[in-house]
Interface confidence: low
Amino acid sequence: EVEKTACPSGKKAREIDESLIFYKKWELEACVDAALLATQMDRVNAIPFTYEQLDVLKHKLDELYPQGYPESVIQHLGYLFLKMSPEDIRKWNVTSLETLKALLEVNKGHEMSPQVATLIDRFVKGRGQLDKDTLDTLTAFYPGYLCSLSPEELSSVPPSSIWAVRPQDLDTCDPRQLDVLYPKARLAFQNMNGSEYFVKIQSFLGGAPTEDLKALSQQNVSMDLATFMKLRTDAVLPLTVAEVQKLLGPHVEGLKAEERHRPVRDWILRQRQDDLDTLGLGLQGGIPNGYLVLDLSMQEALS
C-alpha cells in the first residue's frame, strides 16, 4: 500500500498527454499534479481515458478546489462534466455563456440531467440577469426548458427561440405558460402560409384567444380533438356551433366522445340545443329551444 502512494521513478507527468491512458488508477493519483491538470484541462477531452481514470482526475480537482472549481477549469471539463454531481455543481459560479455552451454541448442529445438543471440554475444565479442570447442558447439545447420557466420568466423569451420548439416540448406547459408563449409563436410564424402556419402554431393554441380561433375556423384547418381539448375554456365558450364545425372539420364527430369533458361540456351548455342538433351527433345539454339567452356579462354591468 505504501509503495502505491509514491510515483514510480520516471513516471511523473510533465504534461497531460496520451501516455497517461496506460497509467493505472493509483499511478494517475500519484503521478499527475492537480495544478498541472487544472491548467491543461482542455487536453483531457482529446484523450480516451476510461471512466475509472476520469474518476481519479475528478478526485484530484476536488482536492485542489474544495470550495468549487474556477470557471477557467469548468469551461474545459468536457466529458468530465458527466462525472460531476449536482452537489459539485452547486459550488460553482458560472457566468460565461461560452462555459455554459461548452458544458451543454457535452450533454447534447440527452434529456436534461440533474447536473444540467443544476448548472443552468447556477448560471442564472451567477449572472443575475439572462439576456436574449442566453435564453436562445438554453432553448436551442433544451426546447423543453421553456415549460420549466414561470410565465414571468417566459415573457422575455425572444420569438426566434420558438422555432426550436417541438410539439412534445410543450407537453408539460400549463395554460398560464401557453398564454405567454402563444403570442410569441404567432409572431414567429406570421409569414408562413395557412396550412404550414397551422402545423407550427398548433402546439401553442392552448394560449389562443377566441378571436384567433374564430379566424382559424375560416381556414379549413381540421383541428384534431386532442388539440381542441387543450384549448382554453374561456376561448372556446364564445365559439358558435358553425365555427366549431368549421374548426374541427371531419374531426367534429369526436365531440360526442368528449361531451362530458372540458371544454366540450361547458361549450355545449352555452349552445342552443337546436344548433347542436344540426351536427347530428346526439349532443345533449344545450339551451332548450324557446329559452331567452341572457348575456351575463352585460347583466352584471347593468346591475
Epitope: 440577469q129 439576456d131 414561470s150
Partner: antibody, heavy 120, light 109 residues
Framework: QLQLQESGPGLVKPSETLSLTCTVS??????????WGWIRQPPGKGLEWIGS???????FYSPSLKSRLNIAVDTSKKQFSLKLSSVTAADTAVYYC????????????WGQGTLVTVSS | EIVMTQSPATLSVSPGERATLSCRAS??????LAWYLQKPGQAPRLLIY???TRATGIPARFSGSGSGTEFTLTISSLQSEDFAVYYC???????????FGQGTKLEIK
Amino acid sequence: QLQLQESGPGLVKPSETLSLTCTVSGGSISSSSYYWGWIRQPPGKGLEWIGSVYYSGSAFYSPSLKSRLNIAVDTSKKQFSLKLSSVTAADTAVYYCARRPYKSGLFDFWGQGTLVTVSS
Amino acid sequence: EIVMTQSPATLSVSPGERATLSCRASQSVSSNLAWYLQKPGQAPRLLIYGTSTRATGIPARFSGSGSGTEFTLTISSLQSEDFAVYYCQQYNTWPPEYTFGQGTKLEIK
C-alpha cells in the same frame, strides 16, 4: 384612435392601498399583441416600471414592488387595474398606464397620467 | 438590476444646432434600447426603439445609434418643440425588469 385613461383617488393615506384603473378605448384590450403596463414618476424625478398584465391575467411585476403589488385585467370592462398596498410617501408619483407590444418591453402608447399623493 | 446612466443631466443647445445625448447601461442590453421624449405636464412619447428605429410619426432629424452598453440619441437640427426631457430605457433583461435612465433635460441656449 387608441386612448388610455387612468382613474382613481388622488390622495391615499400611508399604510393604505393605492388603487388605480386604466380604461382602454379605441382598441381591444383582449388583443394577443399587447401587454398593458403601469409606470410611475415621482415629482421631479425619472420613470419607474411597475408591472404589466396580459389579457389572460398573467401579470409581471417589478421585483422591488412585487410583494406589495397586484395588477389585474377585466376584459369585459376594457380595464386593467393597479393595487399597491402599504403605501408610504415614497409612493407619491404620477402613475401612467401604457401599452406594451408583446414582442418587446418598450411602451408605445401612454395615458396622460394621474397624480397620486400619499399623505395623512 | 441593469442601471441606465444618462449624460449630461442638462444640455443647452441653440435651435437649429445638433444635440447629442448619451445613455450607458451597466451591462450589455444588446440593441434592446428605447428613447422617449417628455414635455412638462405630459406623458412620455416613444421616439426610438431597437436602438435606431424611429417610432411612427417621429421626424427623420431624430436618430439613434450604439449597441451593448453605449447608446446615443442625435437630433440633427433642433426645433423649438424638441426642448424637453429625454429618457432611455432598456428592455433586454430576463426576468423582465425594465429600467429607465434618470433623464437628460434639453434646454434652449
